[in-house]
């Protein structure tokens, strides 16, 4: 004679408020004779959920017809699920006895938990921009999920990050949980086009994680490099001086020319170009008049980038005797 097994296939059953939950239970033998009852919890304080023979259980129906002679399926459905229904449910076989039935065997139990999917993760970056080689923090938050077990991963351009701290609250029992994670990211000079992704995976999402993103362009400031050069060719009595402002981000930039300490107000030609990595180059041309009286001309290109302290580069103009002769000849 086969030994009776009580099969409850689901360890965990996720349910949604208002929906119907099906709790499965099958037996492998019709013996011993006696009823199968459903309980929530264990021990003397357990709660009777369903008894076919007696009691009124308006929200509980059976999946199979329990009156059928060879029925081995004792699964039940509980309608209109509320948070009060969570817990572990056991189907229990009793052996017919006198005056009372005696508990014979219990199933392993099915934990019923409320399933609620996490909200889309929101990623927030630092309040102020930071330069490359420095570390910035990004936070990721997602709320309203249940059960508590959740996976959170951080990526920078698809590469998984390891320097982060994650908290799930509350620590105790709750209807819903929240997750907050802070990742530390070292900025690279080419990160203008980079992205950080916070990915949240939860049992309710069935393998399809939710993603939140932030662009490092909002967090990075790449300071410019300056180079001032004098063009070898001159136009009439003018020398062309170029200030090249390279590899900066963001675009916000003010450039001023000074001649021997005096700020020049006149218009200068300039071009702005974008590099492949998202940084910018700015080139400004300044025409200087050459005359006999101007032996020592010091030009300064000053750049104020993104509200930071100004940086400048100086150039002492080299005017050859030959150039001076030519320019004095050209002066009326």
């Amino acid at each position: 004679e086969e030994e009776l097994q009580m099969i409850q296939p689901e360890k965990l059953l996720l349910v949604t408020v208002g929906k119907t939950a099906t709790l499965h239970c099958t037996v492998t033998s019709l013996l011993p004779v006696g009823p199968v009852l459903w309980f929530r919890g264990v021990g003397p304080g357990r709660e009777l959920i369903y008894n076919q023979k007696e009691g009124h259980f308006p929200r509980v129906t059976t999946v199979s017809d329990l009156t059928k002679r060879n029925n081995m399926d004792f699964s039940i459905r509980i309608s209109s699920i509320t948070p009060a229904d969570v817990g572990t449910y056991y189907c229990v076989k009793f052996r017919k006895g006198s005056p009372e039935n005696v508990e014979f065997k219990s199933g392993p139990g099915t934990e019923m938990a409320l399933g609620a999917k996490p909200s889309a993760p929101v990623v927030l970056g630092p309040a102020a921009r930071t330069t490359p080689e420095h570390t910035v923090s990004f936070t990721c938050e997602s709320h309203g999920f249940s059960p508590r077990d959740i996976t959170l991963k951080w990526f920078k351009n698809g590469n998984e990050l390891s320097d982060f701290q994650t908290n799930v609250d509350p620590t105790g029992q709750s209807v819903a949980y929240s997750i907050r994670s802070t990742a530390r990211v070292v900025l690279d000079p080419w990160d203008v086009r980079s992205q950080v992704i916070c990915e949240v995976a939860h049992v309710t999402l069935q393998g399809d994680p939710l993603r939140g993103t932030a662009n490092l362009s909002e967090a990075i400031r790449v300071p410019p490099t300056l180079e001032v050069t004098q063009q070898p060719m001159r136009v009439g009595n003018q020398v062309n001086v170029t200030c090249q402002v390279r590899k900066f981000y963001p675009q916000s930039l003010q450039l001023t020319w000074s001649e021997n300490g005096n700020v020049c107000q006149r218009e200068t030609a300039s071009t702005l170009t974008e590099n492949k990595d998202g940084t910018y180059n700015w080139t400004s041309w300044f025409l200087v008049n050459i005359s006999d009286q101007r032996d020592d001309v010091v030009l300064t290109c000053q750049v104020k980038h993104d509200g930071q302290l100004a940086v400048s580069k100086r150039l002492a103009l080299e005017v050859t005797v030959h150039q001076k002769d030519q320019s004095s000849d050209a002066t009326p």
Partner: antibody, heavy 123, light 107 residues
Framework: QIQLVQSGPELKKPGETVKISCKAS????????VNWVKQGPGKDLQWMGW????????TYVEDFKGRFAFSLETSASTAYLQINNLKNEDSSTYFC????????????????WGQGTSVTVSS | DIQMTQSPASLSASVGETVTITCRAS??????LTWYKQKQGKSPQLLVY???TLAEGVPSRFSGSGSGTQFSLKINSLQPEDFGSYYC?????????FGGGTKLEIK
């Protein structure tokens, strides 16, 4: 053991509606998503989308938005694919497949498949 | 949408030979790639997931490799049951596009 059993072949006229069923057994139906895949005669596989059996949310590929609908009868562990206003180009075999995920809840592929349902649309 | 390109479209080989099928993604999909095998008139079967992990019950003569945009499936010492069609599919977001398939035939 885990099984996905689909309904039998269908012969329909253009403009009609077909509803294919996919009955799951051997696992908790509401724990895993159900994917739908189309395969034309002698053709490659086309992922149509999937339905989250827990939240009941469906994701459709652009080509399958409008006339196609995924639905569920969770108490019967069954997923359905309904195609409305059938066209000749809908003549194909349709597969349902379970979406598998790892211990960290990350999807990795379709581990169990139905046997396929052949739909023929002909006037 | 991410496009998946498989090559070759068809391939003839003999039992005992080694073959390699490649799959190229139109953009970086990291390791989010799955390989399936389908015999004529049957349902597809999961072979390899996450680019290189063999699914349960899949013989060790199968191996997957690659990441980013280039992937390959290698079958060592072909067996008669290995002949059929092979498909790659990415799962880096939606839609989870399949490759066009590679038909492996007996020479």
């Amino acid at each position: 053991q885990i099984q996905l059993v689909q309904s039998g072949p269908e012969l329909k006229k253009p403009g009609e509606t077909v509803k294919i069923s996919c009955k799951a057994s051997g696992y908790t139906f509401t724990d895993y998503g159900v994917n739908w895949v189309k395969q034309g005669p002698g053709k490659d596989l086309q992922w149509m989308g999937w339905v989250n059996t827990n939240t009941r949310e469906s994701t459709y590929v652009e080509d399958f938005k409008g006339r196609f609908a995924f639905s569920l009868e969770t108490s019967a562990s069954t997923a359905y694919l309904q195609i409305n206003n059938l066209k000749n180009e809908d003549s194909s075999t349709y597969f349902c497949a379970r979406g598998a995920y790892d211990a960290y809840y990350y999807y990795y592929g379709m581990d169990y498949w139905g046997q396929g349902t052949s739909v023929t649309v002909s006037s | 949408d991410i496009q998946m390109t498989q090559s070759p479209a068809s391939l003839s080989a003999s039992v005992g030979e080694t073959v390699t099928i490649t799959c190229r993604a139109s953009e970086n999909i990291y390791s989010y790639l799955t390989w399936y095998k389908q015999k004529q008139g049957k349902s597809p079967q999961l072979l390899v997931y996450n680019a290189k992990t063999l699914a349960e019950g899949v013989p060790s003569r199968f191996s997957g490799s690659g990441s980013g945009t280039q992937f390959s499936l290698k079958i060592n010492s072909l067996q008669p049951e290995d002949f059929g069609s092979y498909y790659c599919q990415h799962h880096y977001g939606s839609p989870r596009t399949f490759g066009g398939g590679t038909k492996l035939e007996i020479k």
